[in-house]
């Protein structure tokens, strides 16, 4: 996350994360400003003249929803400034002179997680936003699955699921006869060191998806799909 430090007694730290499409969510930690100060962050594009986006802080958070034509691209970068009124005058301080959204990504969770039970295995499929489809190969998923009555802390996990929107769970990984739940989260994959800078994304895991429930299939021989394992 990006952090910007204010000066003086009201020092503050901002964290701004993007869903890598049209949204930037910011959170700040600071002593409360006086009533009616209406602070805001201003995102000024360092590339597009006149490209400014206001993020009005409500409590400790604010969200910028970019216009459709400003969907984030790898080369985007912004100057972030903090604005508030004090004694009737606008005070401005610099938060980050070069905020690179692609280095501060928290994607929306995968959607439409579904299960398809066949003899001996369960196929899980999910969807991503159409805006992220070109970056499919850069998306890494983690799956958690468990018996329905168990807590998520007891779930089994499978990670390093990269560049696909499906997964096979074999019957031997599940308890036959029990209803299971699975959920998924996503982040931008950490790529090899030789990747070009404009494809270097960093950030954190998304929130978990809505879980899907399914009946564990009966155990049979392993399924080897014609396209290989994810």
């Amino acid at each position: 996350s990006v952090t910007g430090e204010g000066q003086g007694p009201r020092s503050r730290t901002f964290t701004c994360l993007t869903n890598n499409i049209l949204r930037i969510d910011c959170h700040w930690s600071a002593p409360e400003l006086g009533q009616g100060s209406s602070p805001w962050l201003l995102f000024t594009s360092n590339q597009a003249p006149g490209g400014t986006h206001k993020c009005i802080l409500r409590g400790s958070e604010c969200t910028v929803v970019l216009p459709p034509e400003a969907v984030l691209v790898p080369s985007d970068n912004f100057t972030i400034t903090f604005h508030h009124c004090m004694s009737g005058r606008e005070q401005v301080s610099l938060v980050d002179p070069e905020y690179l959204p692609r280095r501060h990504v928290k994607l929306d969770p995968p959607s439409d997680l579904q299960s398809n039970i066949s003899s001996g295995h369960c196929i899980l499929t999910w969807s991503i936003s159409p805006a992220l489809e070109p970056m499919t190969t850069l998306l890494s998923y983690e799956l958690a699955f468990k018996k329905q009555e168990e807590a998520w802390e007891q779930a089994q996990h499978r990670d390093h699921i990269v560049g696909v929107t499906w997964l096979i769970l074999e019957a031997f990984e599940l308890d036959p006869g029990f209803i299971h739940e699975a959920r998924l989260r996503v982040q931008m994959a950490t790529l090899e060191d030789d990747v070009v800078e404009e494809e270097r994304y960093t950030g954190q895991w998304s929130e978990w998806s809505q879980p899907v429930c399914f009946q564990a299939p009966q155990r049979q021989g392993p399924l080897i799909p014609p396209w290989g394992w994810p």
């Epitope: 499409i21 049209l22 459709p68 034509e69 969907v71 984030l72 691209v73 790898p74 080369s75 936003s129 159409p130 805006a131 489809e133 070109p134 970056m135 070009v196 404009e198 494809e199």
Partner: nanobody, 125 residues
Amino acid sequence: QVQLVESGGGLVQAGGSLRLSCAASGRSFKFYGMGWFRQAPGKEREFVAAISYNGGSTYYADSVKGRFTISRDNAKNTVYLQMNSLKPEDTAVYYCAAGRWYKLGPSEQRTYRYWGQGTQVTVSS
């Protein structure tokens, strides 16, 4: 930053063919939908054709359907516009554009963040 350079324009007789190329810098080319637009003298810039990031979807203006074909080669960072059965009314400066498509359609100029300088196509009768 994606930079686009068009080539392949020129003078051709009606009924002839031309192939325009648009070379893009930067490996992020594969993330972008690509479009061709044109601007005739005294007219506004208009949509010609577009192709999705992986070439899976193509779109054409009604005026060029069946005559023009858009394609791309992500290994070469290049998008092409094959123009057949050219007409005098196809005379214009042709621009290549790149953008991440989302919510706005591929024919909308606001969809595109990066633009080339253009290449002149003149069709004589």
